[in-house]
């Protein structure tokens, strides 16, 4: 049903659903801070620009009854719940923050006639991809994919003389909700990816990663998987890898490797990670003092949502337009705003461009370098390291299909 | 429209040092590899080295390790090479280049000549 | 370091002639790439990944080969070709360049 929304008069109001589900297991109040930074510095933005008006956020929390797993299995009701208790209590704003769950996101979209932004820190999947009045401020699987797939074809490098076509995905079912979504897109067998590549298998238990590390028959010298160096060392342990085994490990919100004192464990020699280029300002802000890497980006995302909503408030009031119109709702892309740290850009679907960065460990420094970067805006390849100190023969990486001649 | 103006010709005696310096403009710096070559007379192009202005990622070419040094200052959008122990086989003609891959060596400075002369 | 050598080293043709440039490799490449330099200016960028034409370069001109040869192609040679043509590969590094082949009026 049509809910009014508390947006006009110089009045404008956020609604953050607060659910018990959430992409990263962040407590809520870190979330509340991080929303209460982000509408000071709106305040102070609208107040500069002449706009005499008031932004507030209300907090919407699940009662937590029935949705209490704490992760995203149980989230796809739990955001129509939320979204019937503001409807009861009249309590709409001009937009939805959250939630940061795939399933839940897919949802609510599904089953609301949705006449305003939604702004989400997740709903990485790609069933939430192409949605008009949805905006994802982390880095969704389709982004992923674009890299790895422009990557897996690339052979004008002096350092990737060979197009990859084919790959193994490890995929154990324990995964985070990002790398969960990440590499379901990457199983999908109608995915982009899938379409692109010859051949493609994964491996669901620990025995049949371990195995392929020196298969002589394995079909693919390229291993893809998602979480952190621990995660990798828990599975590969100090087992012998074939020499010409690529291991990419998917590693997005994470930025310990950017900290001068890391030292990459000898178990990475053979991983690349791919990562999110690290925020110059975050590590001393207020808002994320106290949070680790990966929360960080989760937090920033929903501190970024309130800057976005200031941003489009801003520019709707001052062409003297309505608020609570479709054309508002569908508003919230292909622009750039100015993000908590730095300019923040969105695609013509709502979802924000980064630049990825595929690292590498130098034999002789032990140490995470970067090889090349990758803006997801123009999709382009920018080579950093032409000379990298690999592991690998000749300081190339292999080919993906052990004895095949050169390409 | 994108620009790389080098610092002028210089004349060096055997063993002194000398600094080229390579401003760009208009594209942003720190999104493209600087490269450097050299072109002595009569002699083919020879590649030196590659700078990487935002992580400060430098390559050289094993021939040149010894005698270039690359350096940048991002904020004055300017590449650098410094080239000691200078001897009379060091005069050519050395140029910055851009690289926008997958065209490597997209623009290029107009060049510097140095000179090594007693 | 893969060794590149051009032929001819010296070529005299006239306007309107149809000209091939020949670049081999010391081993094999994916790609080459290609460089124009006339007399008191710097290179400039003219041909990359083998067949791609840089910015602003006429349609006359045209690269093509695989593996250890490569040729760069003018159909009809114009007097604003004449000049040295050099090629180049990064497929290992270092970079390296050929010789060059100087394009002369006849």
């Known amino acids: 049903s049509q809910v009014s929304q508390n947006c006009h008069n110089g009045s404008y109001e956020i609604s953050v659903l607060m659910m018990g589900n959430s992409a990263f297991a962040e407590p809520l109040k870190n979330l509340e801070d991080a929303v209460n930074e982000g509408l000071e510095i709106v305040r102070g933005r609208l107040q500069n620009a002449g706009l005499n008006v008031t932004v507030n956020a209300t907090f919407m929390y699940s009662d937590g009854l029935i949705h209490n797993s704490g992760d995203c299995r149980s989230s796809t009701c739990e955001g129509l719940d939320l979204l019937r208790k503001i409807s009861n209590a009249q309590r709409m704003g001009c937009v939805l923050i959250g939630p940061s769950c795939t399933y839940s996101t897919f949802q609510m979209y599904l089953d609301t006639e949705l006449s305003y932004p939604m702004i989400s820190a997740g709903s990485f999947g790609l069933s939430c991809d192409y949605k008009e009045t949805l905006t994802r401020l982390m880095s969704p699987a389709r982004k992923l994919m674009y890299f790895l797939v422009n990557f897996w074809k690339t052979n004008d490098l002096p350092f990737k003389t060979y197009s990859w076509s084919t790959s193994y995905v490890y995929k154990n079912g324990t995964e985070t909700e990002d790398c969960f979504w990440y590499l379901n897109a990457l199983e999908a067998s109608v995915s982009y990816f899938s379409h692109e590549l010859g051949f493609k298998v994964v491996l669901r238990q620990d025995k049949e990663f371990q195995d392929i590390l020196m298969d002589h028959n394995r079909k693919s010298n390229v291993i893809i998987m998602c979480g952190g160096p621990e995660f990798l060392y828990k599975l590969k342990g100090d087992r012998a890898v074939a020499e010409d085994i690529v291991i990419i490990l998917v590693d997005l919100f994470n930025d310990q490797y950017f900290e001068d004192n890391v030292t990459a464990p000898d178990y990475m020699k053979n991983v690349l990670v791919l990562t999110l280029s690290p925020g110059n300002s975050l590590l001393n802000s207020s808002f994320s003092r106290n949070l680790s890497p990966t929360k960080r980006d989760f937090a920033l995302a929903y501190l970024n949502g309130i800057l976005l909503f200031g941003h489009m408030l801003k520019i709707f009031l001052e062409n003297g337009e309505n608020i609570t119109t479709p054309k508002f709702a569908h508003a919230f892309r292909n622009l750039t705003f100015e993000g908590y740290d730095g300019p923040v850009t969105l695609d013509d679907w709502g979802d924000v461009d980064s630049t990825m960065v595929l690292l590498y460990t130098s034999v002789d420094t032990k140490k995470y370098k970067v090889l090349l970067t990758y803006d997801t805006h123009v999709n382009k390849t920018y080579p950093v390291d032409m000379s990298p100190t690999f592991t690998w023969k000749n300081s190339k990486l292999p080919n993906d299909i052990t004895g095949r001649g050169p390409q | 429209e994108v620009q790389l103006v080098q610092s002028g010709a210089e004349v060096k005696k055997p063993g002194a040092s000398v600094k080229v310096s390579c401003k760009a403009s208009?594209?942003?710096?720190?999104?493209?590899?600087m490269n450097w070559v050299k072109q002595a007379p009569g002699q083919r192009l020879e590649w030196m080295g590659v700078m990487n202005p935002k992580f400060g990622t430098i390559n050289y070419n094993q021939k040149f390790k010894d005698k270039a040094t690359i350096t940048r200052d991002t904020s004055a959008s300017t590449a650098y090479m410094e080239l000691s122990s200078l001897r009379s086989e060091d005069t050519a003609v050395y140029y910055c280049?851009?690289?926008?891959?997958?065209?490597?060596?997209?623009?290029w400075g107009q060049g510097t000549t140095v000179t090594v002369s007693s | 370091d893969i060794q590149l050598t051009q032929s001819p080293s010296f070529l005299s043709a006239s306007p309107g002639d149809r000209v091939t440039i020949t670049c081999s490799a010391s081993s094999s490449v994916n790609y080459m790439y290609w460089y124009q330099q006339k007399p008191g200016s710097s290179p400039k960028s003219w041909i990359y990944r083998t067949s791609n034409l840089a910015s602003g370069v006429p349609s006359r001109f045209s690269g093509s080969g695989s593996g250890t040869e490569y040729t760069l192609t003018i159909s009809s040679l114009q007097p604003e070709d004449f000049a040295t043509y050099y090629c180049?590969?990064?497929?290992?590094?270092?970079?390296?360049f050929g010789g060059g082949t100087k394009v002369e009026i006849k």
């Open positions: 180049q590969q990064y497929h290992d590094y270092p970079p390296t």
């Open positions: 208009g594209y942003t710096f720190t999104d493209h590899n």
């Open positions: 280049a851009r690289d926008d891959y997958p065209n490597y060596f997209d623009y």
